[in-house]
């Protein structure tokens, strides 16, 4: 059974001090969202016993295996059903605690009733505050039965449930008809799936004979031991104040387990801790009684004394539950109550015995669950005991169950049953996950879901280049940590597989499925430097750079230019996709902006070192375009341009620039400055005769402005070829009479 305990603190003077704690003794319990198990859950279950809504309860996690619920503000918050869920996968288990109000009209004589299939269960509700009205019994929140208030027997209302079956299990309540449901008596009925002393799918298997009030689990035949007892058959008492399947937990506080209710996985239910009894578990056992709820009687013989926590304490020379066995009868010594082996291993099991006459090798035998008897292969004889060693054939899953070591001499016989758990080594169900990659290393998460049994003791990561026949490289890692595979080849695919191991010999599982992980390209190492740059307009910048000369091929796919506009907090990135490029034109920039510029080489997704930065100031944008540009041929070599000044000027114009281009020509245009900004007319001279020209112009203040519309005009016919256009300006008012 899962090692899960729900503790309720029943010191109820103040509900704000009330708390519930769920403790798991499972390996890796409650760690949370990783692959090694879901978290512990502790909550109030309002599906059956509904209470008025109140402030939310506070959940506090104490480490990985404990969770506590607090924040109860009034007594009614406590009434009802609480549950703790723990364990992983098929072992996920719910432990239930039912809380009754101490001031209720009806109180349960006993809250938890565990009965066998076919038994008669009797629930008894004791009258605490009488009402002369019907008593309604409910099962799992639905009407079940009615009793007349006259039907009380000795101040108790009884509900008899004959021939109970597992579906009868659940929460029962007894309520006076006119009372609040919070004044009900709440019960928990647990019906085992088998008759008394039997377990298994067809109830064909025999229970081990649980001692000290332990209850045989109907699914796996294990004893669910009361708090304070341990061992396969609950034969061993824990030290006072301890609980858990291995007595590993300790009751909080100075008064030990006083005032605590312990709830364990079904079919046990809830009880006080060992040595305590009463509705609030605050009363010590009466003399002669011991155990959980003080339900057990000592009946010690041969001078044994009764301890309320552990039972009979025997004098020297006697042993047994009631000190009824003489030490002269042979006795199995120090046999572990539970052993764990891995599937297909061939373990050695030792069994030691003492007695008078002294046990010899042939008098000790080992019996498997299927009835097979193994004889010891060797025995070690010491003055006080004989230890027989048994070599077990290769284990199969069917070997899980109760084994028995038996010693027989003429002085009598003794046997000790112990549980053997055959565990299946874990096998990953999925491939490991790549977290990050570099050119020579891969960071891998080995945490994957697995079949078989935990806990995981080690994780091995096997890897080798894809399609390689070389040996696998192996790295052993901690189960909870990510792994870095080092010293790999760049731009190479690696096949990576996980192998999980659990504790013990033969705990290594098969390798999991492979996955392909590829290392990144090598990082580019060369640092470019900026040769120069020049502004080609208010929004255009030409940049050139160089790389140091190194032997061998260039490691790089291209360049990344970065422009940082600190004022606006914006970065512009320009990708130059040729590693041979050494210049680039950046367009669409913001005029009048101060940029920081750098360049770096890239390879795949990796960036090399950036060049030292340069600081570039783009000129602000120029004025609007001149208006109403007009061209008029004056001769075979002259054309006059007229225009109007731009509107809404941001400042005084410093000059105009005229662009002259032969229509349909392939050559570069010619730019001519008009240095007298007050002019609105100019004559372009030195043109070719009978030639069609295109003209446009723009103004300049601090920077060049927008171009005007383009105008066409042809020179007049048949002059000589001129040397090239020149310009003469006049104010428009002076006329053009020369």
């Amino acid at each position: 059974a899962v090692d899960l305990t729900l503790l309720a603190n029943l010191r109820l003077t103040d509900p704000q001090r009330f708390f519930l704690t769920c403790v798991s003794g499972e390996a890796g319990a409650g760690r949370g969202s990783d692959a090694w198990g879901p978290p512990l859950l502790l909550e109030k279950d309002d599906r059956i016993v509904r209470t008025p809504p109140g402030p939310p309860l506070r959940l506090a996690r104490n480490g990985s295996h404990q969770v506590t619920l607090r924040g109860f503000s009034k007594p009614s918050d406590l009434v009802g059903v609480f549950s703790c869920v723990g364990g992983a996968g098929a072992r996920r288990t719910r432990v239930i605690y039912v809380h009754n109000s101490p001031g209720a009209h009806l109180l349960p004589d006993k809250v938890t009733h565990t009965v066998n299939k076919g038994d008669t269960a009797v629930l008894s509700a004791r009258v605490h505050k009488e009402k002369q009205t019907d008593v309604i019994w409910k099962s799992n929140g639905s009407y079940f039965y009615t009793l007349d208030w006259h039907e009380a027997q000795d101040g108790r209302f009884l509900l008899q449930l004959p021939n109970v079956q597992p579906p009868s299990s659940g929460i029962y309540s007894a309520t006076y008809l006119e009372a609040s449901p919070l004044g009900s008596a709440f019960f928990r009925l647990i019906v085992r799936g088998c008759g008394a002393g039997r377990w298994g799918p067809g109830c064909t298997k025999e229970c081990p004979g649980c001692l000290h009030g332990g209850v045989c689990h109907d699914h796996d035949g294990e004893c669910v031991c009361p708090p304070g007892f341990t061992g396969t058959r609950c034969e061993q008492a824990c030290r006072e104040g301890r609980f858990g399947q291995s007595c590993q937990e300790q009751c909080p506080g100075i008064s030990g387990c006083r005032g605590l209710t312990f709830c364990l996985p079904d079919p046990y239910g809830c009880s006080c801790g060992s040595g305590w009894r009463g509705s609030q578990c605050q009363e010590a056992c009466a003399p002669g009684h011991f155990g959980a709820d003080c339900r057990l009687q000592c009946q010690c013989q041969n001078g044994g004394t009764c301890d309320r926590f552990s039972g009979c304490v025997c004098p020297s020379g006697w042993h047994g539950v009631h000190c009824e066995k003489s030490d002269r009868i042979p006795q199995i010594l120090n046999m572990a109550s539970e052993l764990e082996f891995n599937l297909e291993t061939m373990p050695r099991i030792n069994c030691a015995a003492a007695g008078n006459p002294f046990p010899v090798r042939g008098s000790i035998e080992l019996r498997k669950p299927d009835g097979t008897v193994l004889l010891s292969t060797k025995a070690i004889v010491e003055p006080e005991k004989t230890t027989a060693e048994f070599e077990v054939p290769r284990l199969v899953l069917a070997d899980s169950g109760f084994w028995e070591c038996r010693v027989s001499t003429s002085g009598g016989q003794d046997s000790r049953r112990f549980k053997v758990n055959v565990k299946v080594p874990p096998v990953p169900l999925a491939a490991p996950r790549l977290l990050t990659k570099q050119s020579r290393q891969l960071v891998v998460s080995p945490l994957v879901s697995f079949s078989g049994d935990g806990p995981i003791s080690t994780v091995r990561l096997h890897y080798r280049p894809q399609d390689s026949t070389m040996d696998w490289s192996t790295i052993v890692v901690d189960p909870s940590e990510n792994v870095t595979l080092m010293n790999l080849r760049p731009k190479t695919g690696y096949s990576v597989r996980v192998q999980l191991s659990r504790p013990g010999e033969g705990g290594e599982g098969a390798w999991g499925p492979p996955t392909l992980m590829t290392t990144d390209c090598p990082e580019p190492l060369l640092q470019p430097w900026l040769e120069g740059w020049h502004v080609e307009g208010t929004d255009r910048l030409r940049v050139s750079w160089s790389l140091p000369l190194v032997p061998g091929p260039l490691v790089g796919d291209g360049f990344l230019l970065r422009l940082w506009d600190g004022t606006r907090g914006q970065e512009r990135r320009e990708n130059v996709s040729s590693p041979q490029a050494r210049t680039a034109l950046l367009t669409g920039l913001t005029p009048g902006t101060h940029y920081q510029l750098d360049v770096q080489l890239y390879h795949c997704t990796l960036l090399g070192p950036a060049s030292p930065p340069a600081h570039v100031l783009l000129p602000p944008s120029g004025p609007p375009a001149p208006r109403h540009l007009h061209a008029q041929a004056l001769s075979d070599s002259e054309i006059q341009l007229t225009w109007k000044h731009p509107e809404a000027l941001p400042g005084p114009i410093s000059k105009y620039v005229v662009e002259v281009q032969v229509a349909g020509g392939a050559g570069d245009p010619l730019w001519i400055d008009v240095d007298r900004p007050e002019e609105t007319s100019t004559i372009i001279r030195g043109l070719n005769a009978s030639t069609r020209y295109l003209f446009r112009m723009r103004a300049s203040i601090q920077g060049l402005g927008d171009w005007s519309n383009t105008v066409e005009e042809s020179t007049l016919g048949n002059g000589l070829q001129a040397e090239g256009p020149v310009q003469e300006s006049r104010a428009a008012e002076e006329g053009l009479d020369q």
Partner: antibody, heavy 127, light 102 residues
Framework: EVQLLESGGGLVQPGGSLRLSCAAS????????MGWVRQAPGKGLEWVSW????????TYADSVKGRFTISRDNSKNTLYLQMNSLRAEDTAVYYC????????????????????WGQGTLVTVSS | DIQMTQSPGTLSLSPGERATLSCRAS???????LAWYQQKPGQAPRLLIY???SRATGIPDRFSGSGSGTDFTLTISRLEPEDFAVYYC?????????FGQG
């Protein structure tokens, strides 16, 4: 499906006796409180008697106390009403009904209700 | 005994209209112990409302109950043709259980 089927009604002279039966099916009869309600021709409903699931507790209307006896046989899923010293004013359709209990809000007290009724059997007391 | 008095004795309405039926107890009744039943000619009564305001299984939501203490009301928000019937209130608070006159 829950069903209640009354039988045993008929014509009887004043002072005579009659035994009504109610056969129940479709639910766990032995868990429920059961009762008889009657309705005189053209009149309203009048509660007559009820009996607890165990048969241990019974209650009667003043008008029938001492003359009528309610009983049940849980093994046969049957409710009975033994009517003695019948009078003309006992003439009515007799219905058997199941008492159920509802958890109306989940937080407040339980609310009862007669949730299933038989089709009724007519008892006529006349000379 | 607690007397249950219903009013009006007869309510004449048409389909689609709203019906309001009143039930008054001679002494205070816990709202948990007040039920309403519907009876059509030649049929057994049918439980409509329990606990003064909770609808029984299968009862349409046009039926609603309210009230506390001595005054209780059954409301049919929009009458359907099949709603024309005799309605009874009943108290369970003290023995004997008593019905209104309908």
């Amino acid at each position: 499906e829950v069903q209640l089927l009354e039988s045993g009604g008929g014509l009887v002279q004043p002072g005579g006796s009659l035994r009504l039966s109610c056969a129940a099916s479709g639910f766990t009869f032995s868990s429920y409180k059961m009762g008889w309600v009657r309705q005189a021709p053209g009149k309203g409903l009048e509660w007559v008697s009820w009996i607890y699931p165990s048969g241990g507790g019974t209650t009667y209307a003043d008008s029938v106390k001492g003359r009528f006896t309610i009983s049940r046989d849980n093994s046969k899923n049957t409710l009975y009403l033994q009517m003695n010293s019948l009078r003309a004013e006992d003439t009515a359709v007799y219905y058997c009904a199941r008492v159920n209990y509802y958890d109306s809000s989940g937080y407040g007290p339980i609310a009862p209700g007669l949730d299933y009724w038989g089709q009724g059997t007519l008892v006529t007391v006349s000379s | 005994d607690i007397q249950m008095t219903q009013s009006p004795g007869t309510l004449s309405l048409s389909p689609g209209e709203r019906a309001t039926l009143s039930c008054r107890a001679s002494q205070s009744v816990s709202s948990s112990y007040l039920a309403w039943y519907q009876q059509k000619p030649g049929q057994a009564p049918r439980l409509l409302i329990y606990g003064a305001s909770s609808r029984a299984t299968g009862i349409p939501d046009r039926f609603s109950g309210s009230g506390s203490g001595t005054d209780f009301t059954l409301t049919i928000s929009r009458l359907e043709p099949e709603d024309f019937a005799v309605y009874y209130c009943q108290q369970y608070g003290s023995s004997p259980w008593t019905f209104g006159q309908g």
